[in-house]
């Protein structure tokens, strides 16, 4: 089941998934100046067994110098500022990126590939966040965020983090606070399943990724 | 010369149902990905649904799943998004956009598609 929406956002912070849940797609993206090539995948699909998970299909660029690339034909309803990249990073593999069952690592560089990466998470996939450059962690819980499945829907889990200026003196600026989560809520006030498949090994296997998650600057 | 032209917006009261169709003229529905956005007055851009021409991946944002339907005629080159239990928060001039690549979804994704039509209203009373 596809995630319906994408992971929070939290003001001057990124987030990165250190493995993918078998179900996952990647788009096969090319940058400007490429397009897929006409029998190619439209997505990459992670798949697999109980002892082994990998990237189905092969994303492929070629050339496309040859046709006109300008293509809006109306204004867009609101022009869209350059967007920063959230679960479209740029491809990196953690040193000690463990292999969790059912879940694959990022997948490898594709020759002209586009500079974000965009994903289709599925229910259980948990995604990691961590302030950009020039701003500091202000932790109120885990800075993580899990997509669940409650009631039919799929939501994601409001990760606990505020990110602050280094110059910010105030320890909440401008009251930021988290949205309420539903995750204040006891289990037991909700009369519903809540599905967080592998939910307990990504969070053990946060503690020891914890210096090495982000280990390259983003643009 | 490429065009996408959405109809089938008007008045409804809540609870009720619209369907809104995109003709496209100068594309091939049938090798790009169709997509619904919409726009409140005051409000950014918010993705609706969307679709891939294989049919591979559809998305819905969160706050239609369930209520929306994204669909699509490859031959008759049209797209349609039918759209039950109507809420006035549903208000809004909706968008269709088609790109050739796969499905973008989310809370800024309307940058990656290519081409737009000039959106329709609709507007739920209570």
């Known amino acids: 089941e596809l995630c319906d929406d994408d992971p929070p956002e939290i003001p001057h912070a990124t987030f990165k998934a250190m493995a993918y849940k078998e179900g996952t797609m990647l788009n096969c993206e090319c940058k400007r100046g490429f397009r897929r090539i006409k029998s190619g995948s439209l997505y990459m699909l992670c798949t697999g067994n109980s002892s082994h998970s990998s990237w189905d299909n092969q994303c492929q660029c070629t050339s496309s110098a040859t046709r006109n690339t300008t293509k809006q034909v109306t204004p867009q309803p609101e022009e869209q500022k350059e967007r920063k990249t959230t679960e479209m990073q740029s491809p990196m593999q953690p040193v000690d990126q463990a292999s969790l069952p059912g879940h694959c690592r990022e997948p490898p560089p594709w020759e002209n590939e586009a500079t974000e990466r965009i994903y289709h998470f599925v229910v259980g996939q948990m995604v990691y966040y961590q302030c950009v450059q020039g701003y500091r962690a202000l932790h109120r819980g885990p800075a993580e965020s899990v997509c669940k499945m409650t009631h039919g829907k799929t939501r994601w889990t409001q990760p606990q983090l505020i990110c602050t200026g280094e110059m910010e003196t105030s320890q909440f600026p401008g009251e930021e606070k988290p949205q309420a989560s539903p995750e204040g809520r006891p289990e037991s006030e909700t009369s519903c399943l809540v599905t967080t498949t592998d939910f307990q090994i990504q969070t053990e296997m946060a503690a020891t990724m914890e210096t090495s998650i982000f280990t390259t600057e983003y643009q | 010369e490429v065009q996408l032209v959405e109809s089938g917006g008007g008045l409804v009261q809540a609870g009720g149902s619209l369907r809104l169709s995109c003709a496209a003229s100068?594309?091939?529905?049938?090798?790009?990905?169709m997509a619904w956005f919409r726009q409140a007055p005051g409000k950014e851009r918010e993705f609706v649904a969307a679709?891939?021409?294989?049919?591979?991946?559809?998305r819905y944002a969160g706050s239609v799943k369930g209520r929306f339907t994204i669909s699509r005629d490859n031959a008759g080159n049209t797209g349609f998004l039918q759209m039950n239990s109507l809420r006035p928060e549903d208000t809004a001039v909706y968008y269709c956009?088609?790109?050739?690549?796969?499905?973008?979804?989310?809370?800024?994704?309307?940058?990656?598609?290519?081409?737009w039509g000039q959106g329709t209203q609709v507007t739920v009373s209570s």
């Open positions: 956009a088609a790109r050739e690549g796969g499905v973008v979804a989310g809370v800024r994704s309307g940058a990656p598609y290519d081409y």
């Open positions: 100068g594309i091939t529905f049938n090798d790009h990905t």
């Open positions: 679709r891939d021409w294989s049919d591979i991946i559809t």
